[in-house]
């Protein structure tokens, strides 16, 4: 079952799927001046069995001016540095990321791919959030969103992440210091100086899953 909407947006944060559930579709989009080859797929589809999942179909782009099929070559670094997962810019996954049963990894780039990747997620998909560069988490509750089916409709859970500019926060003189954290997440001595990497403390994430570096998105 496809999710009706995109995952929720959080101010000054980006989201990333660490793996894609079977049934996920990725549109075959080409950058300006290029189009899908005539017999080319409209989308890639994450399919599989109990032991292995992979992307069916290959996206191929050709110059709008010619009718040639394209060579499958690795794009230049500047071409692959900004890829979007629906509304989010995201880099490729590290190739050594542990596989999750029933999930596909980030598909490799294709030549002349559009800079924005448009995914169609399915129920059960989870995406993870972190603050963009220059912002930090004022509060980090569960920083993920899951597409769930309730009463016959799909909805994404709301991530409890609040991102703020580095120097915006304050702890007033005489305010109690935060107590020691039972969850073992690092805390700041003074709120203005917190610079911990957001995903360093993503304890909810499966231990087997490596986090990827997020690229920034400013709104």
């Amino acid at each position: 079952e496809l999710c009706d909407d995109d995952p929720p947006e959080i101010p000054h944060a980006t989201f990333k799927a660490m793996a894609y559930k079977e049934g996920t579709m990725l549109n075959c989009e080409c950058k300006r001046g290029f189009r899908r080859i005539k017999s080319g797929s409209l989308y890639m589809l994450c399919t599989g069995n109990s032991s292995h999942s992979s992307w069916d179909n290959q996206c191929q782009c050709t110059s709008s001016a010619t009718r040639n099929t394209t060579k499958q070559v690795t794009p230049q670094p500047e071409e692959q540095k900004e890829r979007k997962t629906t509304e989010m810019q995201s880099p490729m996954q590290p190739v050594d990321q542990a596989s999750l049963p029933g999930h596909c990894r980030e598909p490799p780039p294709w030549e002349n791919e559009a800079t924005e990747r448009i995914y169609h997620f399915v129920v059960g998909q989870m995406v993870y959030y972190q603050c963009v560069q220059g912002y930090r988490a004022l509060h980090r509750g569960p920083a993920e969103s899951v597409c769930k089916m309730t009463h016959g409709k799909t909805r994404w859970t709301q991530p409890q992440l609040i991102c703020t500019g580095e120097m915006e926060t304050s702890q007033f003189p005489g305010e109690e210091k935060p107590q020691a954290s039972p969850e073992g997440r690092p805390e700041s001595e003074t709120s203005c100086l917190v610079t911990t990497t957001d995903f360093q403390i993503q304890t909810e994430m499966a231990a087997t899953m490596e986090t990827s570096i997020f690229t920034t998105e400013y709104q």
Epitope: I10, H139, G141, Q171, S191
Partner: antibody, heavy 115, light 107 residues
């Protein structure tokens, strides 16, 4: 079920300070930040600030800096709003509200500042 | 600060009617906007978050739309329990600000 419990009313003299409590129950308290909102006849709803129930880190509306101080006590799942040097202008209803989208609100504490 | 301007300030309608309340932000708020309903003597209740997502338990006759600076809340087939005051609020950048409210009264 999720509940945010606040005292119903407080009557205080001008010049004193007051600490209003907001006790969360029915959920994991530290998962959700806590906001404080003031409602007065003159100004409708005004956001005072937000505090991380996890770290104690707080973000204030500039308008309330020096007037309001937010704290949390994780052991009792309670957020506090302390209001200093109270005047009749501070008479209002003070609400706590949970999470990014203010999905649950306390019933409000009606503060009356009067001599 | 972002100024949220709600219109109309008050509105009279009958049960079964459809009404629309609008909210204009003085700056781009993207889709970071909530709608709340408040009844006399009660605390506000979340109706819609992120401009268009219905909060859990909210009837489907309510719907939110818009992005950027223009937002609206539509109530189809008004029910007796829908009368009260409605507020919009943005959460893009601080301070978060609320609209002045729209009082929906029974005609």
């Amino acid at each position: 079920q999720v509940q945010l419990q606040q005292p119903g009313a407080e009557l205080v003299r001008p010049g004193v300070s007051l600490k209003i409590s907001c006790k969360g129950s029915g959920y994991t308290f530290t998962d959700y930040a806590m906001h404080w909102v003031r409602q007065s006849h003159a100004k409708s709803l005004e956001w005072i600030g937000v505090i991380s129930t996890y770290s104690g880190d707080a973000l204030y509306n500039q308008k309330f800096k020096g007037k309001a101080t937010m704290t949390v006590d994780k052991s009792s799942s309670t957020a506090y709003l302390e209001l200093a040097r109270l005047t009749s202008e501070d008479s209002a209803i003070y609400y706590c509200a949970r999470g990014v989208t203010f999905d649950y609100w306390g019933q409000g504490t009606t503060l009356t500042v009067s001599s | 600060d972002v100024v949220m301007t709600q219109s109309p300030a008050s509105l009279s309608a009958s049960v079964g009617e459809t009404v629309t309340i609008t909210c204009r932000a003085s700056e781009n708020s993207y889709s970071y906007l909530e709608w709340y309903q408040q009844k006399q003597g009660k605390s506000p209740q979340l109706l819609v978050y992120n401009a268009k997502t219905l909060a859990e338990g909210v009837p489907s006759r309510f719907s939110g739309s818009g992005s950027g600076t223009q937002f609206s809340l539509k109530i189809n087939s008004l029910q007796p329990e829908d009368f009260g005051t409605y507020y919009c609020q943005h959460h893009y950048g601080t301070p978060y600000t609320f609209g002045g409210g729209t009082k929906l009264e029974m005609k």
